[in-house]
């Protein structure tokens, strides 16, 4: 028969009314022993039920030392079967057995839920010898019980290679509800339904749940745990929590914020990192994401020029990194740049616009009418050209770059010369005789080197061969460059 120990009467007892052999304790069970030593045979047995043998795990000794009569089977006395108590209380329970004195070295071990309890547990075994038997009482005490102490405790005794096992003593530690699942913070779409979950457990059960929204109860009557709250939709941020109640009282979950997804705030601090003639590298600081991750961003570029048509160029880019190189821009131009980013709800407003300029470009055309002739008396080549018609964006002409390549049997040599912007002619020394010299000229601005002119070739004879006829680039629209020797 299982007996039960209980604490003080509950507001709503699990077992209403008195139960035979039941005990609820906030301190120690009726079976606990005083912390004294010495012989106390009167305390050996359970006061709730006299000890009696049973047919479970018993050791049956074969014969006495005299070899004549059989001994009775060995078994632990029946004890309290169920102790119910509150968290943080102390409890003490015990097993008792009477062992004939013929047995030596009897030890009792305590087990919880199938595992032996070793080490720092408060287990005390007391021996009370008599003429024929020794009463053994094994006490187990737990101070300030916790939920983790819940479980089934048994005593085991090894004797003559036989194992004797006691009835289980089930310890039930009751306390306030304990949350196993609390509501989680969420970001939700405006006016869209969503669910929150709250789960708490005892013992004691049942656990009932109340939901709270912004310090007001959502349900005036509770729901059994676990509880799922379906919120039909919100138009503004709200804080939710849940209360869990059981026979021990109530506990409150953490409060969680439910945010309403919105369009992001505009980016801030758009800044210029690098400008070239045709590109600008910008970065920005993202605005608040509106409780929804950024998907992408849009860089908007307007040319600041009274003569431009005011059209906006739009460059789409990923939201991260917060940087973009704007390409295909005109050189030496002013631009107004803004950035907008989007999430699942929509686009942010555009950031404050910033002004940026591209640098000078390189010339877009080559010098015109390039002519080349040999001045044998000076042993040099005379080169003449016309200044190219460069656009404003190319910037100011700073000079020219002349490429001359000398080719003869088994030799090829390229040389570069720089000349100032005021010149429209140059002389270069003959590098190799009996060779072809190919000349190309490019205009140079601060923005870089423009395209080279079409090549003009001139043959440089061996010493003594004189020919002053020039070579020149053809007039526009003519065929290949003419080579005059």
């Amino acid at each position: 028969a299982i007996t039960e120990a209980r604490e003080e009467a509950k507001p709503y007892p699990l077992f209403p009314g008195p139960l035979p052999g039941s005990l609820q304790t906030d301190h120690t069970s009726l079976l606990s022993l005083p912390h004294t030593s010495g012989y106390q045979p009167a305390l050996m047995f359970s006061p709730t039920q006299p000890g009696r043998p049973y047919t479970g795990n018993v050791a049956i000794p074969r014969v006495t030392s005299a070899g004549s009569k059989l001994l009775p089977p060995l078994a632990f006395k029946h004890t309290v079967g169920h102790i119910i108590l509150s968290e943080h209380k102390d409890v003490k329970f015990n097993c008792s057995i009477s062992v004939p004195n013929i047995y030596q070295d009897t030890t009792i071990s305590w087990w919880k839920d199938g595992k032996e309890l070793l080490g720092a547990h408060h287990a005390i075994t007391q021996f009370y010898p008599d003429d024929e038997v020794t009463a053994i009482i094994a006490s187990f005490s737990i101070t300030s019980v916790q939920r983790s102490d819940n479980g089934s405790y048994i005593c085991k005794m090894k004797i003559n290679n036989e194992e004797i096992v006691s009835d289980p003593i089930y310890i039930e530690v009751q306390g306030l509800p304990h949350f196993t699942k609390q509501p989680e913070s969420m970001n939700v779409t405006r006016n869209t339904a969503f669910n929150l979950t709250c789960q708490a457990v005892g013992p004691p059960e049942p656990v009932n749940i109340f939901w709270v929204q912004n310090s007001s109860r959502v349900n005036e009557q509770p729901e059994k745990s676990p509880s799922v709250l379906t919120v039909p939709g919100l138009t503004e941020m709200a804080v939710f929590s849940c209360e869990a109640h059981n026979d021990k009282g109530l506990t409150v979950s953490k409060g969680v914020q439910i945010n309403i997804k919105a369009i992001p705030s505009p980016p801030t601090e758009v800044s210029i990192h690098n400008s070239t003639a045709h590109s600008i590298l910008i970065s920005w600081v993202p605005g608040f994401d509106g409780y929804s991750p950024f998907r992408n961003c849009s860089v908007q570029v307007k040319e600041v020029d009274p003569l431009s048509n005011g059209s906006v160029m739009i460059f789409n880019t990923s939201a991260s990194p917060h940087m973009y190189q704007i390409k295909q821009l005109q050189a030496l131009a002013n631009y107004s740049i803004g950035v907008s980013c989007m999430n699942e709800i929509g686009w942010s407003a555009v950031s404050p616009w910033i002004l940026a300029s591209t640098t000078e470009g390189a010339p877009s055309v080559a010098p015109l009418n390039v002519t080349v002739f040999l001045n044998e008396s000076r042993d040099n080549v005379d080169i003449r050209w016309m200044k190219p018609l460069t656009k404003r964006q190319a910037g100011e002409l700073v000079g020219y770059r002349i490429s001359h390549v000398w080719q003869s049997a088994g030799i090829s040599k390229e040389l570069l010369e720089e000349v100032g912007q005021n010149n429209s002619r140059a002389q270069i020394s003959v590098q190799v005789h009996n060779a072809t010299c190919t000349v190309r000229i490019a205009a140079v601005t601060k923005g870089g080197v423009g395209p080279f002119s079409d090549p003009v070739k001139i043959f440089i004879p061996a010493h003594g061969w004189v020919d002053h006829a020039p070579s020149s680039t053809p007039a526009p629209g003519n065929a290949d460059p003419v080579l005059i020797i």
Partner: antibody, heavy 121, light 112 residues
């Protein structure tokens, strides 16, 4: 032993404000709630609502929304009932009662001794 | 709100005799969880109310077993098998199934 001790009787004029206290001892104050019940002379007991002693979240019965406010001083393990803009109909005895929802429903297990409020011009 | 009606208003009983109080609700008190949250309180003269019974028939700790509760749905009864002097006072039924909680008008038990 759990005890709820309420403040003494009050005599007030219409339009004034009263604040009744309920001091709890013998248990962990924040692990339960406190209900307030009105008992007017010759009338039914009337449940006014309850407050969660941990979170301070209050629920009011419809007849007690507006002029009535529950509050807490957790460090002093005390719950309060404040009634603003008093009228003659507020004359009654007000009880606090320990409250939470157990396996048998709402508990209402320990009651204060009551505070008598008289509103008279 | 659920209206709780108690009868009789006053009950005069000789000590040792039985007593019975009726409580009727305007709606069923059977909750969706299968429980019926009908409770009884006793307010002795000059004292605050004391919980007596919950879930129709379950006695609170310390309440003698001469008190019994019965009923279901909307009709409930509190019975005292043998009235004793300490039983006098006003008995209230109240319901916790529906919001808000509501009380009966009370039945005054007096000793003849």
């Amino acid at each position: 032993q759990i005890q709820l001790v309420q403040s003494g009787p009050e005599l007030k004029k219409p339009g004034e404000t009263v604040k009744i206290s309920c001091k709890a001892s013998g248990n962990t104050f924040t692990t339960y709630g406190m209900s307030w019940v009105k008992q007017a002379p010759g009338k039914n007991l009337k449940w006014m609502g309850w407050i969660n002693n941990y979170s301070g979240v209050s629920t009011y019965a419809d007849d007690f929304k507006g002029r009535f406010a529950f509050s807490l001083e957790t460090s002093a393990t005390t719950a309060y009932l404040q009634i603003n803009n008093l009228t003659n109909e507020d004359s009654a005895t007000y009880f606090c009662a320990r409250d939470y929802y157990g396996s048998g429903g709402w508990v209402f297990d320990y009651w204060g001794q009551g505070t008598t409020l008289t509103v008279s011009s | 709100d659920v209206v709780m009606t108690q009868t009789p208003l006053t009950l005069s009983v000789t000590i040792g005799q039985p007593a019975s109080i009726s409580c009727k609700s305007s709606q069923s008190l059977l909750d969706s969880d299968g429980k019926t949250y009908l409770n009884w309180l006793l307010q002795r003269p000059g004292q605050s109310p004391k919980r007596l019974m919950y879930l129709v028939s379950k006695l609170d700790s310390g309440v003698p077993d001469r008190f019994t509760g019965s009923g279901s749905g909307t009709d409930f009864t509190l019975k005292i098998s043998r009235v004793e002097a300490e039983d006098l006072g006003v008995y209230y039924c109240w319901q916790g199934t529906h919001f808000p909680r509501t009380f009966g008008g009370g039945t005054k038990l007096e000793i003849k």
